[in-house]
């Protein structure tokens, strides 16, 4: 069957019908419904929401909707023994204690089961000691402290401001520096935009607001007790001492009112420069310890959280494909939230719900997509991407053979300025073409395309007249699909103006103040940005599932491979003498990239010319496109990160949220001048160049004529 035989509507009308069916008012209604109570992973409330979504997706017309459950390691505060931080005097008396909860927002005072701020998976402990302020606790911040300022964090409690990098990386860095505890806080410099009021009068973080979040370093493992395999009924679980990625020192988050009380007493060294100063009225001294009269006072942490194996539930909906039911396009986003989830995740879940409803409406009218569409409502994303990873582990054999694409659908908004897209280069042309067909929701761009407003507000740094599209990193549910399985992936959301708003994420991220009202009053009263995101995400899924030829352009991969090779070569060339001494050459990598470019170009020519009415040839060409992303997977994975297997992209070893290109080579080169055995270090660089060159060449050959 051709795709037209699979439907009673013409292809052009299909997409239009699907997009026209998406309604802002429905997204608004769904968001309201999803945000009235907390939906913390592992709780009864979140199980009930899973069953509600299952029921509604069935009503919307999906062919089947199932719950997939797993028993994974989660973390909760002790309800009778709260976590807090004290300043203690020389007699051990607590002279200051941090707050035990966030003041609830108006209208939510009587809501039960609001989990107090905590760092998920923190071990228990009551360390006490001198404080050291470590800025953002990035790798370079600890380099500054240890190598430049000669400050030893060993045996100290460190206080770090949130932002710039994933909190798990901060904790890992602190552990490596020898710290015995970590305090995380939100500085107004990063979470309070100038000229905006704090919630409930605006979208800024109040002084009592606190960011929750997990502090794991899973590196793609999923459930810490069952790495590589699903946490099912007959799972073999590791002991807690062998669990993957758990922190070894107590960690706790606080707001800026409490942080002020700790930081105002800091002594020791002045901050090294302006980049270490936030916006509080404190000197931002680094320490160690308190100043003058307070020098005998210490900081003490009281952490009593527990790790518990708990049942979680994914909702998996299926819309069977009419022509290629064994080819899967997946739209997934998480359902679990820290508290109300006004933005994260429910602004995304509401969009998925409306996309499912629209597809269901078309299906009820007799239409089917060419390929199968799977819809997923993931659980326990906030606890380490657990729901999506366990499901992918359980279904890995199907996914690696049948997975065409994965589109992520977490928060639809993190601002209301312009579109933000991170995706595989295979999807660049799809995203460009789609956004040219969609209307911009932006003020001043009435009647203009989304592509035009996006390009104007967020121009590509390399190509004029094109918008910026970023590399995929991690910190969301696409991770297992892209980084482990090599399934082409993408994500889209509306974002802030990064030029003028330099705070990290959005101010109320993971706080109790992330409510429906936050979105409805301050971010998107008309829900027009949500609708646009629904059109982008839904439109991508529609095209991926319905195009006769997959909408992937392998030539765009060739372009970025050359850019990434140039970049890693220039990093290496900062050490010209060593490259000479150890005979380090990038010739093999550049040669492989050149071959890839030529083969991709020829493949694209054949793609224009082949007989699309021949189902065997069509399937063959589509399979070459589908399996191209898979060809970048190294079955052995990256050094010490076996579940990050993509050779071209991986989450940065220094920031899980950021993507790094040629990560194997990058990590081998990182801080190479400090390695004790330069010969061994440069040998590893050479090995990583070899792996990268081989992988690019092997991927190129998958695009060659098959015989």
């Amino acid at each position: 069957k051709s795709s037209n035989e699979a439907t009673n509507i013409t292809p052009k009308h299909n997409m239009k019908a699907f997009l026209d069916e998406l309604k802002a008012e429905n997204i608004k209604k769904f968001l309201y419904n999803f945000t009235q109570i907390p939906h913390l992973a592992g709780t009864e409330q979140n199980f009930q929401l899973a069953k509600q979504i299952q029921s509604q997706w069935k009503e919307f017309g999906l062919d089947s909707v199932e719950l997939a459950h797993y028993d994974v390691l989660l973390s909760y505060p002790n309800k009778t023994h709260p976590n807090y931080i004290s300043i203690i005097n020389e007699d051990g008396n607590e002279i200051f204690n941090t707050s035990l909860f966030e003041p609830p927002p108006p209208g939510y005072e009587n809501v039960s089961d609001i989990v107090p701020p905590f760092s998920a998976f923190s071990p228990q402990g009551m360390p006490e000691g001198d404080l050291v302020y470590v800025n953002y606790a990035r790798t370079e911040d600890f380099f500054k402290l240890e190598r430049d300022m000669k400050i030893n964090c060993s045996g100290k409690i460190v206080i770090a401001r949130y932002g710039k990098v994933f909190r798990g990386n901060k904790v890992k860095n602190a552990q490596l520096a020898g710290a015995k505890g970590v305090i995380l806080y939100s500085d107004p410099a990063d979470y309070f935009a100038p000229g905006v009021k704090s919630y409930p009068d605006g979208w800024n973080l109040p002084g009592g607001g606190v960011q929750r979040g997990n502090i794991l370093n899973l590196n793609g493992a999923g459930d810490p007790l069952t790495p590589g395999y699903p946490a099912n009924e007959y799972a073999y679980r590791r002991g807690i001492a062998e669990a993957v990625g758990l922190p070894s020192i107590p960690v706790h988050p606080i707001g800026y009112y409490d942080a002020q009380k700790l930081l105002e007493k800091m002594g020791g060294s002045a901050p090294p420069d302006s980049s270490w100063r936030g916006s509080l009225k404190v000197p931002y001294n680094v320490g160690p310890g308190f100043t003058g009269n307070f020098s005998t006072q210490k900081v003490k942490m009281h952490i009593h959280s527990t790790n518990e194996v708990t049942r979680i539930y994914n909702v998996i909906g299926t819309l069977r494909g009419a022509v290629e039911p064994d080819r899967y396009v997946i739209l997934g986003g998480h359902r679990d939230s820290w508290v109300f989830g006004g933005i994260d995740p429910q602004s995304g879940a509401a969009v998925v719900h409306e996309i499912v409803r629209s597809f269901g409406t078309l299906k009820k009218e007799g239409w089917r997509p060419r390929r199968t569409i799977l819809f997923a409502s993931w659980d326990a994303e906030e606890f380490g991407l657990l729901g999506s990873t366990e499901w992918a582990e359980e279904n890995s054999r199907l996914l690696q053979e049948r997975g065409v694409a994965y589109i992520n659908a977490d928060s639809s908004i993190e601002g209301n300025y312009t579109l933000r897209v991170d995706c595989t280069p295979l999807m660049y042309s799809l995203v460009h073409n789609l956004t040219k067909e969609l209307k911009s929701p932006d003020e001043g761009f009435e009647g203009k395309s989304l592509y035009e407003s996006w390009t104007k507000k967020s121009p590509s740094p390399e190509f004029s007249g094109m918008p910026r599209i970023s590399k995929l990193g991690s910190g969301n549910d696409f991770e297992v699909f892209f980084q482990r399985l090599g399934i082409a992936s993408g994500r889209a959301r509306y974002t802030k103006n990064w030029e003028t708003n330099k705070f990290s994420g959005y101010p109320l991220y993971h706080s109790v103040y992330e409510t429906y009202e936050l979105v409805e009053k301050f971010y998107d009263p008309m829900f027009k940005y949500h609708l646009t995101v629904a059109q982008v995400r839904g439109g991508m899924v529609f095209e991926l599932a319905n195009s006769i030829v997959l909408p992937f352009d392998c030539r765009d991969y060739a372009v970025v491979l050359r850019k990434y090779a140039d970049k890693i070569y220039s990093i290496s060339m900062k050490h010209p003498q060593e490259m000479k001494t150890y005979s380090v050459s990038f010739d093999s990598l550049f040669s492989a990239v050149k071959n890839f470019t030529e083969i991709a170009s020829k493949f694209s020519e054949r793609l224009q010319d082949f007989d699309k009415s021949n189902p065997i040839v069509l399937r063959m060409m589509n399979d070459q496109l589908m399996f191209l992303e898979r060809a970048f997977i190294d079955p052995l994975g990256l050094p010490d990160r076996p579940f990050y297997r993509h050779v071209i992209y991986a989450p940065s070893s220094h920031n899980k949220y950021a993507g790094e290109s040629f990560p194997g080579i990058y990590d081998a080169l990182f801080d190479i001048e400090s390695k004790v055995d330069p010969s061994k270090a440069w040998g590893e660089v050479k090995r990583q160049i070899y792996v990268a060159a081989f992988t690019v060449q092997a991927a190129a050959e998958t695009l060659s004529e098959v015989a």
């Epitope: 430049d148 060294s269 002045a270 000197p283 001048e673």
Partner: antibody, heavy 115, light 107 residues
Framework: EVQLVQSGAEVKKPGASVKVSCKTS????????IHWVRQAPGQSLEWMGN????????TYNQKFQGRVTITVDKSTSTAYMELSSLRSEDTAVYYC????????WGQGTLVTVSS | DIVMTQSPDSLAVSLGERATLSCRAS??????VAWYQQKPDQSPKLLIY???TRHTGVPDRFTGSGSGTDFTLTISSLQAEDVAVYFC?????????FGAGTKVEIK
């Protein structure tokens, strides 16, 4: 071994600007703070400001605020200090120093301000 | 600004004898104090940081001590090559400030 090599002596008229360079080698440039310090003839040391070469973060002595600008060029591992609106009392030897604790010093650059 | 007051202005000590240099901060600076040696027509050199930690390659006859407001640099056995001006400096708060220096000579 760590070396900081500064540009040569300068003679300037009052009201003019001077830009002194400090080329570093023998260490990872982005790792150490660069400070600028001056020493008037027969006098003590006076801190002018510093920069984090990794991200360009600066802190200036308010005494010089608005007159001094410290920059870096990572590609050449070089730091610069520009002092504007020069007056006769700015006559001094200007030093760059690498490391938060002024671990390594340049040889100094004599700037003479005279009409 | 924190004022660093050094005493004495100059000090003459016999070869092999102990030299004790003092530095007082106008307010508590913890242990965020460094000491530098400047020989005639040379750039200063770091001797001590964190009040008492010797910089790499500094002979162990140089010892720093103190915390809060009072700091001392001791040269346990003066050598001819130690003739120089010694500066203390605080890095507890901006602006970073130096003392006026103590000139050490051979008696």
């Amino acid at each position: 071994e760590v070396q900081l090599v500064q540009s040569g002596a300068e003679v300037k008229k009052p009201g003019a600007s001077v830009k002194v360079s400090c080329k570093t080698s023998g260490y990872t440039f982005t790792e150490y703070t660069i400070h600028w310090v001056r020493q008037a003839p027969g006098q003590s040391l006076e801190w002018m400001g510093n920069i984090n070469p990794n991200n360009g973060g600066t802190t200036y002595n308010q005494k010089f605020q608005g007159r001094v600008t410290i920059t870096v060029d990572k590609s050449t591992s070089t730091a610069y200090m520009e002092l504007s609106s020069l007056r006769s009392e700015d006559t001094a030897v200007y030093y760059c120093a690498a490391g938060w604790n002024f671990d390594y010093w340049g040889q100094g650059t004599l700037v003479t301000v005279s009409s | 600004d924190i004022v660093m007051t050094q005493s004495p202005d100059s000090l003459a000590v016999s070869l092999g004898e102990r030299a004790t240099l003092s530095c007082r901060a106008s307010q508590d600076v913890g242990t965020a104090v460094a000491w530098y040696q400047q020989k005639p027509d040379q750039s200063p050199k770091l001797l001590i940081y964190w009040a008492s930690t010797r910089h790499t390659g500094v002979p162990d006859r140089f010892t720093g001590s103190g915390s809060g407001t009072d700091f001392t640099l001791t040269i346990s056995s003066l050598q001819a090559e130690d003739v120089a001006v010694y500066f203390c400096q605080q890095y507890n708060s901006y602006p970073l400030t130096f003392g006026a220096g103590t000139k050490v000579e051979i008696k």
